[in-house]
Amino acid sequence: YDFTNCDFEKIKAAYLSTISKDLITYMSGTKSTEFNNTVSCSNRPHCLTEIQSLTFNPTAGCASLAKEMFAMKTKAALAIWCPGYSETQINATQAMKKARKSKVTTNKCLEQVSQLQGLWRRFNRPLLKQQ
């Protein structure tokens, strides 16, 4: 999906109002310095591409993020404010269903959510030069 035509300001507002709080809740009890940010993005469409991938695609050691509250609200925001997004997800979701059976918070998942927080922060500051 090409995120170029999304309403970035509305997605940002939804993130600041509620998604960010859900990410913090997920990470509660974890030190903010515990994980190094290794995933980066260069502009808002690129950030949303990386956020989508990290939120919804199962990875080794963390298959369950798509069932978390922040993921549900992220999906809602992308579907509402990115034209045609929900239609493109039909085939993609079917491929992921088997990997989503249980919700287990592993250290790998905590690291992945820490990366997500970094991507969202970068999304909110689009004019900053890439480090």
Partner: antibody, heavy 121, light 108 residues
Framework: QVQLVQSGAEVKKPGASVKVSCKAS????????MNWVRQAPGQGLEWMGQ????????NYNGKFKGRVTMTRDTSTSTVYMELSSLRSEDTAVYYC??????????????WGQGTTVTVSS | EIVMTQSPATLSVSPGERATLSCSVS???????LHWYQQKPGQSPRPWIY???TLASGIPARFSGSGSGTEFTLTISSLQSEDFAVYYC?????????FGGGTKVEIK
């Protein structure tokens, strides 16, 4: 304007199944999660689960797992909630409620009129 | 699961008086995830207050919401006849979504 219109009242025998429908109009159906909430007579509200019409993804309340199935038909903008192995305690009004951002806060912003399901032998 | 406890179960108030409804949450949640709904007999619930303190469209200013963490409050500064109803709090912080048992505001 957003409207959620539910199917009519049902009377079922214990052990049977019931399928309630909720037809949506006035918004982009595929883009909003739909929730199902029930209310037993004289009781409070109980969340059963939700479905994302765009891809059919579901999140269920563990209390109903194995008994509840939520599906959707995008061609008619309708979501369905099927509850099986009915017992008398399932007698309730069943509501569909859209999940949406209001002032960028996420909540159930529109509700159907409710469907009364009576389970009686 | 997060347990929502509302008190009192029934509140008897005279028109023009102030009403305070409480919602206690079993574990701390963000204020953005606490909502209130109003329900009248034979009707569907209606969104009333979003995110602890934001009034839904068309809700009169005599209603207000406050709180944080585990304690939240809905206040009606001067009760009008149309305010007599049941009010439910609800959290959207973690699954399963849960509602309080409701507070019935009745005419004294």
């Amino acid at each position: 304007q957003v409207q959620l219109v539910q199917s009519g009242a049902e009377v079922k025998k214990p052990g049977a199944s019931v399928k309630v429908s909720c037809k949506a109009s006035g918004y982009a159906f595929s883009s909003y999660w739909m929730n199902w909430v029930r209310q037993a007579p004289g009781q409070g509200l109980e969340w059963m689960g939700q479905i994302f019409p765009g891809d059919g993804e579901t999140n269920y309340n563990g209390k109903f797992k194995g008994r509840v199935t939520m599906t959707r038909d995008t061609s008619t903008s309708t979501v369905y909630m099927e509850l099986s192995s009915l017992r008398s305690e399932d007698t309730a009004v069943y509501y569909c409620a859209r999940g949406g951002y209001v002032n960028f806060l996420y909540a159930m912003d529109y509700w159907g009129q409710g469907t009364t399901v009576t389970v009686s032998s | 699961e997060i347990v929502m406890t509302q008190s009192p179960a029934t509140l008897s108030v005279s028109p023009g008086e102030r009403a305070t409804l409480s919602c206690s949450v079993s574990s701390s949640i963000s204020s953005s995830n606490l909502h209130w709904y109003q329900q009248k007999p034979g009707q569907s619930p209606r969104p009333w207050i979003y995110g602890t303190s934001t009034l839904a469209s068309g809700i009169p200013a005599r209603f207000s919401g406050s709180g944080s963490g585990t304690e939240f409050t809905l206040t009606i500064s001067s009760l009008q006849s149309e305010d007599f109803a049941v009010y439910y709090c609800q959290q959207w912080s973690s699954y399963p979504l849960t509602f309080g048992g409701g507070t019935k505001v009745e005419i004294k």
